[in-house]
Amino acid sequence: KKEDGESTAPTPRPKILRCKCHHHCPEDSVNNICSTDGYCFTMIEEDDSGMPVVTSGCLGLEGSDFQCRDTPIPHQRRSIECCTERNECNKDLHPTLPPLKNRDFVDGPIHHK
């Protein structure tokens, strides 16, 4: 998902950006704050047992446009949101898991309310 301050071709920021990191803190982070030349992100995905896991941190400029594009991966429920508009902007990102597709289930049809 695209957020404020982004464009399709990422341009280098003139200054470093600080992001909250959780489950994804690099060695050079301090007090769960990482720094980057790219984007802050928050991601939600299912672990092996089907439980939702939220991860947040920094994405370097290199390759981050592709990573922030959130292209669907078959058989993987995952959603990522990226931002650059202010330091720790990813504190306010709340991606949600995409809905389950019927074919992901083997135990009968789903009934929506």
Partner: antibody, heavy 116, light 112 residues
């Protein structure tokens, strides 16, 4: 051209506070962090902390937490550092410096003397 | 904190000589983005520091090409190919990979 203007000197009494200023010109103030660095004779350079004028987000050297408070006034493109409970150990030259991914421009420094 | 160790502390040279200053860090300065934030500054007597080299080997605008920087990881070098009188002063290395950012103790370049 980029300029960071700081007062040349300040003399203050022990136990008081002081607010040092740094007026930026020649660039968009909110596009860069502002750092503050302390230099005492024979003690090298010490990073105090930095502030992002675009959102007033601050990062401090743990050593200076409680001693230094960084603020900005974006309307006048001025950064400030308040130093509290001053002692002779705070006597030094204090520099402001523009920071993106590295410091590229420094102010001329303010010489702070703490003396009764 | 990352300790930056500069050698030598004092470097007496003759004008026209080559000068070499070493800077070692207590941890790798390779940032998680892949950049190495190691920089060199010159401080002349009574002045504020001036940027010479940023990110290991990039000369800042207006810096003569007799200044060059090299190195990687924890080991870095500043070279001045032919020392001129205006080069005299104290040289500092600095890292902005790890918070708190830290500086070397300085190398004083002086006339022999």
């Amino acid at each position: 051209q980029v300029q960071l203007q700081q007062p040349g000197a300040d003399l203050v009494k022990p136990g008081t506070s002081v607010k040092l200023s740094c007026k930026a010109s020649g660039y968009t103030f909110t596009s860069y962090w502002m750092q503050w660095v302390k230099q005492r004779p024979g003690q090298g350079l010490e990073w105090i902390g930095e502030i992002d004028p675009s959102d007033t987000y601050t990062m401090y050297n743990q050593k200076f937490k409680g001693k230094a408070t960084l603020t900005v006034d974006t309307s006048s493109s001025t950064a400030y550092m308040q130093l509290s409970s001053l002692t002779s150990e705070d006597s030094a030259v204090y520099y402001c410096a523009r920071f993106g991914y590295y410091v590229d421009y420094w102010g001329q420094g303010t010489t702070l003397t703490v003396s009764s | 904190d990352v300790v930056m160790t500069q050698t030598p502390l004092s470097l007496p040279v003759s004008l026209g000589d080559q000068a070499s200053i070493s800077c070692r860090s207590s941890q790798s300065l390779v940032h998680s983005t892949g950049n190495t934030y190691l920089h060199w500054y010159l401080q002349k007597a009574g002045q504020s520091p001036k940027l010479l080299i940023y990110k290991v080997s990039n000369r800042f605008s207006g810096v003569p090409d007799r200044f060059s920087g090299s190195g990687s990881g924890t080991d870095f070098t500043l070279k001045i190919s032919r020392v001129e009188a205006e080069d005299l002063g104290v040289y500092f290395c600095s890292q902005s990979t790890h918070v708190p950012f830290t500086f070397g103790s300085g190398t004083k370049l002086e006339i022999k």
